[in-house]
């Protein structure tokens, strides 16, 4: 019987060009985590295998960093990064636990990057 639960960072937002940490935490189970997969719309971003460590997909290698912990850091965000992300915990003997995070990447604030007016 699967007793575990996954807590995630839920719905999050970040600015274009910035970075964000995607975090999931598996609790309430003594199952052994054999691998954690990070996926976006059926695309595999990265895995952290208990035996063989972190492996990042070549498509994301320049913008994805492992950690902290079993989390994933996305860098140089673009508006196209907006969407659902899934952490998939493969465990023994329980099986698979999945957590969902929705990331919204926002255009940089006008205050920071907009036109600046000088008072004469």
């Amino acid at each position: 019987m699967m007793t575990g639960t996954i807590e995630t960072t839920g719905n999050i937002s970040a600015e274009k060009g910035g970075s964000i940490i995607l975090q999931c935490h598996l609790s309430s189970t003594t199952a052994q985590v054999t691998q954690v997969n990070w996926e976006q719309q059926d695309q595999l971003l990265a895995i952290c295998n208990a035996d063989l460590g972190w492996h990042i997909s070549p498509s994301f290698k320049d913008r994805v960093a492992p950690g902290p912990g079993l989390g994933l850091t996305l860098q140089s965000l673009t508006v196209n990064d907006t969407g659902e992300y899934f952490c998939i915990y493969h465990t023994y003997p329980d099986g698979t636990y999945t957590g969902r995070i929705f990331l919204e990447v926002l255009e940089s604030s006008v205050a920071e990057h907009g036109a600046r007016f000088q008072i004469p």
Partner: nanobody
Framework: EVQLVESGGGLVQAGGSLRLSCAAS????????MGWFRQAPGKEREFVSA????????NYADSVKGRFTISADNAKNTVYLQMNSLKPEDTAVYYC???????????WGQGTQVTVSS
Amino acid sequence: EVQLVESGGGLVQAGGSLRLSCAASGFTFSDYVMGWFRQAPGKEREFVSAISWSGTNTNYADSVKGRFTISADNAKNTVYLQMNSLKPEDTAVYYCATRALRDGRGYWGQGTQVTVSS
């Protein structure tokens, strides 16, 4: 049927080199992480090195960094472990292993003996 067949082990003097090979069959090579582990007499099996995604990712245990190099030939479905500057403490049975990118399920080879004499 998944098969991992190691070769290249043997007896070598300290400071020497060996190249281990692991020929894989029965699965799509690019969908897996390939790795090497080793087990010395009376000790637990330990991670040595791993490679994935057509060689774009490699990991090494601290004890072998700078001395061992992992590589893969995707056309031959073979992973290699080039071992240089070998030390007596590298003596062990070396096992090839694989883990599926999608779900982590794994397979092991039968192992090849490496003995480093001082």
